[in-house]
């Protein structure tokens, strides 16, 4: 299995990953296998009305870049001295044995992977491309039959079955062959979206690929800057009784997703008011209305907000409430 | 491309429960609300009721409240409509639309399925 | 009232110019949404907002509202356009929908 993957956004539309090779590989190494897929956005996003009071808007970051090569390790270290470097302490006897046991182990592991799970495929031609994956099949562990390895504990593997596993969308995932090298530049991703990083390392390459168990790692791309700005005016109508429709078009593109819009207007002479428009209320109204204004001059920005912040200010919208009507609501039906 | 497929035609007796379906792709499923609109042999239009499937919020039109039930599973990207017990009155041409364009206004439609109550 | 009544039947020559009515207490608060449905079809949206077309429908239609009335206008009708239609809007509570009892148009 590659080891230490780690991955980084260095733009909106590229990932970086590097890794270190196995410790123990079983052969020589040829070629690793990359796989990447988009991940949905948390379902909780598109249940809760992050219009509420006390309610915090989601917090998501991108994968920042690397600070140097060793980076990650500076959350395993055992202390920081007064300069924040950092420093392990040394290893006991117990330790360095148990390691050694350690890698002994994943070794047996994964030669029992390799020769059991894995059902040897051919090579993929191409990089980049879409994989069709038709002779790779990996076995479910309820196909395995029975094995003297040493492996954690699987309850009572059933006889190896010789069905092959239906094609599975999942199998259609676009990937990159890397050869010689640790490290790969995923291009081409959507701005701000998160991507399930799959990595196996191969030691064979013709006629039939053969190829570790998979080490995952999850990034997200950085978001574009004018992403989740408003394009387009904001309309206005006003109906009877003062009610003003307001109306924009949601960003084509956001990052990740809007979860509200603010809409601020303010009469001219008074101080701004706020407005907040959740996601599911502009799914409805494709806009708010207002209700209850004092007559006089308006002018009305709004923007957008996604899982990256906020966008920018849309340019004042202007209108002119004639007469006032009493109501108490400022947000309509 | 977006599209909205509706479960087959049905026949049922009287009395009998049912649960039709309506599956969107290309578009934020969990986000966009989405509505049914009955139609009898021969008549107009009705609106039933919509729902937002990402928190399963439902409106009924006063009508339709009681009568039927709106669910949708977001997992599958499904919005159902649903009978516990049907009646010959329910013999109709449903079909499921997308709020879309502008508000409350529906912008994509499912070809429609034919339910047909007799005994 | 949150109904929205319709004229049930109106008919103009190939060419010429007609206009559909959609009449009800909440058009004075809402827009209306005009739908076109020919036999054995689902509904196509034709018009909404003030005077808004989808992509893919001709701009011979157009729209507008006036106090409790929202129309809907063919400029030079085809024979493509014979189906009826449906106008929608909310209702006066503004909590529901509710559509119109739609218009037969024949070309002739």
């Known amino acids: 299995v590659p080891l230490d993957p780690i991955s980084v956004s260095n733009s909106s539309s590229q990932i970086i990953l590097k890794w270190k090779p196995p410790s123990d590989p079983n052969g020589n190494i040829t070629h690793y296998l990359v796989f990447w897929e988009r991940q949905a956005e948390d379902s909780e996003l598109f249940e809760l009305d992050y219009c509420l009071k006390g309610l915090k808007l989601p917090s998501r970051t991108w994968s920042p870049p690397f600070e140097s090569e060793d980076s990650q390790k500076h959350n395993q270290s055992e202390y920081e001295d007064s300069a924040g470097e950092c420093c392990s302490c040394p290893k006991t006897d117990s330790q360095i044995l148990k390691e050694l046991e350690e890698s002994s182990f994943r070794k047996t592991f994964e030669d029992y992977l390799h020769n059991v799970v894995f059902v040897p495929r051919k090579t993929s031609s191409g990089t980049g491309a879409e994989d069709p994956r038709p002779s790779r099949k990996r076995r479910s562990l309820g196909d395995v039959g029975n094995v003297t390895v040493a492996v954690p504990t699987v309850a009572a593997f059933p006889n190896t079955s010789s069905t092959s596993v239906p094609t599975s969308p999942e199998e259609h995932r676009p990937f990159e062959k890397v050869v010689n090298k640790e490290s790969l530049v995923i291009s081409g991703l959507r701005h701000f979206t998160g991507y399930r990083i799959e990595l196996q390392a191969c030691n064979q390459d013709t006629p039939e690929e053969r190829c570790s168990v998979a080490a995952y790692v999850s990034a997200r791309t950085m978001p574009e800057a004018k992403a989740d700005d408003i394009v387009g005016p904001v309309t206005h109508e006003i109906f009877e009784n003062n009610v003003v429709h307001l109306m924009w078009q949601e960003p084509k593109e956001p990052n990740g997703l809007i979860v509200l819009y603010e809409v601020s207007y303010r009469r001219y002479g008074d101080e701004e008011l706020h407005l907040c428009v959740s996601r599911k209320h502009f799914a409805l109204e494709r806009g708010c209305r207002l209700r209850g204004l004092s007559p006089g001059n308006y002018s009305v920005r709004i923007r957008a907000t996604s899982l990256a912040g906020n966008g920018s200010w849309t340019e004042p919208t202007y209108f002119y409430v004639t007469d006032y009507l009493d109501v108490p609501s400022n947000i309509a039906k | 491309q977006m599209q909205l497929v509706q479960s087959g035609a049905e026949v049922k007796k009287p009395g009998e429960s049912l649960k039709i379906s309506c599956k969107g792709s290309?578009?934020?499923?969990?986000?966009?609300?989405i509505g049914w609109v009955r139609q009898m042999p021969g008549k107009g239009l009705e609106w039933m009721g919509i729902?937002?499937?990402?928190?399963?919020?439902?409106r009924y039109s006063p009508s339709f409240q009681g009568q039927v039930t709106i669910s949708a599973d977001r997992s599958i990207s499904t919005a159902y409509l649903q009978w516990s017990s049907l009646k010959a009155s329910d013999t109709a041409m449903y079909y499921c639309a997308r709020v879309g364009a502008s508000g409350w206004t529906f912008d994509y439609w499912g070809q429609g399925t034919l339910v047909t109550v007799s005994s | 009232s949150s109904e929205l009544t319709q004229n049930p039947a109106v008919s103009v020559a190939l060419g010429q110019t007609v206009r559909i009515t959609c009449q009800g207490d909440?058009?004075?608060?809402?827009?209306a949404s005009w739908y076109q449905q020919k036999p054995g079809q689902a509904p196509l949206l034709v018009m909404y907002d003030r005077n808004s077309r989808p992509s893919g429908i001709p701009d011979r239609f157009s729209g507008s509202r006036s106090g409790n009335t929202a129309s809907l206008t063919i400029t030079g009708a085809q024979a493509e356009d014979e189906a009826d239609y449906y106008c929608?809007?909310?209702?006066?509570?503004?909590?529901?929908?509710?559509f119109g009892g739609g218009t037969q148009l024949t070309v002739l």
């Open positions: 729902i937002y499937p990402g928190d399963s919020d439902t």
């Open positions: 290309g578009y934020s499923f969990s986000s966009s609300w």
């Open positions: 929608n809007s909310r209702d006066s509570s503004g909590n529901h929908a509710v």
């Open positions: 909440s058009l004075r608060n809402y827009y």
